[in-house]
């Protein structure tokens, strides 16, 4: 399969691609939603002692194929060349999701013996920084 | 991450050659003329979240815990996205038509997972 669309030429494309992602994403429906989550709700409170809760962000929204006429590029920060061809390939629907490599860790205090001893650990890839249609 | 082999409809990496000539970028990207950028496709059923290498992150596990309990965010769609991307060396013209050779991040989809 080949992409069905020709992109307008942009010599500064790669500079844009290296720029931090902008919010909101190019598809206005795709956005970041905040949610206060407690580890008790998750059933993890016997493992994660502190913090008891944290602000969790997730990506939400649609990724239609409408591309503004002035958009000559994939969403800055998204994978450059694959990013838009995804949406033009059969079976490859763009998805509103956290940009790979931009998730941040959460630092927690944990126990494995019911609270007799504690460990400080880092939960990787937990905090969503940016959402995009990818 | 799974490789698409035509026999699975689960989230997998599909090999795909991106030809810069076909997308009209060959007048500013000098080299290469194309490359295997690949893409992700396939379904992401809830049970995949527990399979090592398929859930893209701890973050996904949290969302899936919510899903399985029928709690908000129930409307969050799990979908197949790149979880590992790699860099590729490229030669291109900048705004002033000076030639630049740079290792550009996030060019190649190496692995896919459910988010």
């Amino acid at each position: 399969s080949t992409p069905l669309m020709s992109w307008p030429w942009s010599p500064s494309a790669l500079r844009l691609l290296q720029r931090p992602p902008e919010e909101p994403a190019a598809h206005a429906n795709c956005h970041r939603v905040a949610l206060n989550i407690s580890f008790q709700e998750l059933g993890w409170e016997r493992w994660i002692v502190y913090p008891p809760s944290f602000i969790f962000h997730y990506c939400h929204g649609g990724c239609g194929l409408h591309i503004p006429p002035n958009l000559s590029l994939p969403v800055p920060g998204a994978p450059p060349t694959p990013a838009q061809p995804y949406s033009l390939l059969p079976g490859a629907q763009p998805c509103c999701a956290a940009l790979p490599g931009t998730m941040r860790p959460l630092h927690v205090r944990t126990t494995s013996d019911g609270g007799y001893s504690f460990k400080y650990e880092t939960v990787p890839n937990l905090l969503t920084q940016h959402c995009a249609c990818i | 991450g799974l490789e698409c082999d035509g026999r699975t409809n689960l989230c997998c990496r599909q090999q795909f050659f991106i030809d810069f000539r076909l997308i009209g970028w060959n007048d500013w990207i000098i080299a290469p003329t194309g490359y295997y950028g690949n893409y992700c496709e396939g379904s992401c059923p809830a049970y995949l979240a527990g399979v090592p290498g398929s859930a893209s992150s701890f973050h996904t596990a949290v969302v899936n815990q919510y899903r399985m309990r029928g709690l908000n965010p129930g409307t969050v769609n799990s979908c197949c996205i790149p979880t590992k991307l790699s860099t590729m060396s490229m030669l291109y013209f900048d705004d002033e038509y000076n030639i630049v050779k740079r290792d550009v991040p996030n060019m190649i989809v190496e692995e896919c997972g459910c988010a």
Epitope: W9 | R21, G24, N26, D27, W28, I30, A31, T33, S89, L91, E96, Y97, N98, I99, K101
Partner: antibody, heavy 122, light 108 residues
Framework: QVQLQQPGAELVKPGASVKLSCKAS????????MYWVKQRPGQGLEWIGM????????NYNGKFKTGATLTVDKSSSTVYMQLSSLTSEDSAVYYC???????????????WGQGTSVTVSS | QIVLTQSPAIMSASLGERVTMTCTAS???????FHWYQQKPGSSPKLWIY???NLASGVPARFSGSGSGTSYSLTISTMEAEDAVTYYC?????????FGGGTKLEIK
């Protein structure tokens, strides 16, 4: 084999314009930049500008920005350079050259036309 | 723009002699984007050496190129009669692309 065909000579009057052609064959025309180079009698080479046949994108040497216009006709695999308001300074041989890939990120003007000799004289 | 200065403008060498001509750039040029072209009288220029040191197809092994930054050179290990033509250096690192004024090689 790759060929770039240019007319041999053009005689034009001062103040007039001339449109030089460069017909390409033997390769995929829309995949390569085409360059134009000027050489005055007994002098060195001067890069005028370049055009990409696929998109029509152009880039000019500032010195020639007003006097030269590059265009392309994909259907005939021909690039053109129009020179306007000619003076005796424009009397020169004008070459078109394909900018080709030599592998390992190496590019160069690998094929040249025979050149068109332009004489500006009343 | 990057100015390329070739020296000498004209040089004479005996057959069999080792010949070196130089090209100095007004500012640094990546060796990847530095070429030499050969031009015979009445003919189009020909790509001779690309990316500083790689010989173009059909160029005799007696030719070599070297250099980096602002200083580049073309060397002929043993001069032959057919080598007595003009050589131009060229950079395409910074726009506008520029050529040197040429070095005309003559037989002594």
């Amino acid at each position: 084999q790759v060929q770039l065909q240019q007319p041999g000579a053009e005689l034009v009057k001062p103040g007039a314009s001339v449109k030089l052609s460069c017909k390409a064959s033997g390769y995929t025309f829309t995949n390569y930049w085409m360059y134009w180079v000027k050489q005055r009698p007994g002098q060195g080479l001067e890069w005028i500008g370049m055009i990409h046949p696929n998109s029509g994108s152009t880039n000019y040497n500032g010195k020639f920005k007003t006097g030269a216009t590059l265009t392309v006709d994909k259907s005939s695999s021909t690039v053109y350079m129009q020179l306007s308001s000619l003076t005796s300074e424009d009397s020169a041989v004008y070459y078109c050259a394909r900018w080709g890939y030599g592998g390992n990120y190496d590019y160069a003007m690998d094929y040249w036309g025979q050149g068109t000799s332009v004489t500006v004289s009343s | 723009q990057i100015v390329l200065t070739q020296s000498p403008a004209i040089m004479s060498a005996s057959l069999g002699e080792r010949v070196t001509m130089t090209c100095t750039a007004s500012s640094s040029v990546s060796s990847s984007y530095f070429h030499w072209y050969q031009q015979k009288p009445g003919s189009s220029p020909k790509l001779w050496i690309y990316s500083t040191s790689n010989l173009a197809s059909g160029v005799p092994a007696r030719f070599s190129g070297s250099g980096s930054g602002t200083s580049y050179s073309l060397t002929i290990s043993t001069m032959e009669a057919e080598d007595a033509v003009t050589y131009y250096c060229h950079q395409y690192h910074r726009s506008p692309w520029t050529f040197g004024g040429g070095t005309k090689l003559e037989i002594k």
